[in-house]
């Protein structure tokens, strides 16, 4: 039987390796049954998650799932860090797992490291 609770489909310990200067969309896949919940993004600062107020967000609707998108236009070096989306549903706060953005400031395309290299070269990270 399919649950009618709101569910947020961000994988635990998920990561995205992205480049400063590029556009990027961070998606929070949201499953709900009737009324679409109010969803917000926050950025982790230690143990607290600071709500992102003045950031461009949008919804993308698909047949079985909706996506609440945080837009980075463009990605900046200080966008590096961990993010979480949260949904308000029937007075309950449902929090996603956090997802981490690793931002590299690469001067030219020829210098772009692979995902594996970025994971193993923390000095590239801001």
């Amino acid at each position: 039987k399919e649950s009618c609770d709101v569910q947020l489909y961000i994988k635990r310990q998920s990561e995205h390796s992205i480049l400063a200067g590029d556009p990027f969309e961070l998606e929070c896949p949201v499953k709900y049954c009737a009324n679409r919940p109010h969803v917000t993004w926050c950025k982790l600062n230690g143990t607290t998650c600071v709500k992102l107020e003045d950031r461009q967000t949008s919804w993308k609707e698909e047949k079985n799932i909706s996506f609440f998108i945080l837009h980075f236009e463009p990605v900046l070096p200080n966008d590096n860090g961990s993010y979480r989306c949260s949904a308000n549903f029937q007075s309950n706060l449902i929090e996603s797992h956090s997802t981490t953005l690793y931002v590299t400031d690469v001067k030219s395309a020829s210098e772009r490291p692979s995902k594996d290299e970025m994971a193993s070269r923390p000095w590239l990270l801001y």
């Epitope: 994988k11 635990r12 310990q13 998920s14 990561e15 594996d116 994971a119």
Partner: antibody, heavy 119, light 112 residues
């Protein structure tokens, strides 16, 4: 029915490379992390690393970094483990496993494939 | 790396009797999301491992309720209330809180 089937094992000479495949069915591979583990004869389990088929991100145990490459083709529901510069001590049964990434709802293991590194 | 230490390494048990396996981690397995990612696997002779317990105490579907997991932080236990012949095999704890993920050495359960 959920299935994970490893293939590509066998006898390989030291210094050579090998690519193992893990063919999955019965679930959406992109909702999971694909892990590779190995078990040397008569020994315990060791985590090699994992891949996120949704975006290609990979993590490895330090001793495998640079020598192992884990990848996945989400459209074909197949994951791969490429092992280079094989040594005799890499002789083991290699297992793939698929763990649901959002709520830990399932953790499926394949039957394993034996890799024997010997001259 | 997080070191996982199981005891005992060998566990002879009489059929119908209880069994208990301990697993200790070298650092806390409590993640920042408030959950503890400690799993127990069973490997029967000649078979591949299967997940028995996840998130310390949640039983996988199809796992008999004679299996239970408990613990927190760094100290965890797998209990079998009444051992049956089909329970023979090696039991492993493994953590997926911290990279790299690590295993205990395994506990071999056999019938006396």
């Amino acid at each position: 029915e959920v299935q994970l089937v490893e293939s590509g094992g066998g006898l390989v000479q030291p210094g050579r490379s090998l690519r193992l495949s893990c063919t999955t069915s019965g679930f959406n591979i992109k909702d999971t992390y694909i892990h590779w583990f190995r078990q040397a004869p008569g020994k315990g389990l060791e985590w090699v690393g994992r891949n996120d088929p949704a975006n290609g991100n990979t993590k490895y145990t330090a001793s495998f970094k640079g020598r192992a490459t884990i990848s996945a083709d989400g459209s074909k529901s197949i994951a791969y483990l490429q092992m280079n510069s094989l040594k005799t001590e890499d002789t083991a049964v290699y297992y793939c496993a698929s763990y649901e990434g959002y709520y830990e709802r399932f953790g499926y293991w394949g039957q394993g494939t034996l890799v024997t590194v010997s001259s | 790396d997080v070191v996982m230490t199981q005891s005992p390494l060998s566990l002879p048990v009489t059929l119908g009797q209880p069994a208990s396996i301990s697993c200790r981690s070298s650092q806390s397995l409590l993640d920042r999301d408030g959950k503890t990612y400690l799993n127990w696997l069973q490997q029967r002779p000649g078979q591949s491992p299967r997940r028995l317990i996840y998130l310390v105490s949640k039983r996988d579907s199809g796992v008999p309720d004679r299996f239970s997991g408990s613990g927190s932080g760094t100290d965890f236990t797998l209990k079998i209330s009444r051992v049956e012949a089909e329970d023979v095999g090696v039991y492993y704890c493994w953590q997926d809180t911290h990279f790299p993920y690590t295993f205990g050495q395994g506990t071999k359960l056999e019938i006396k």
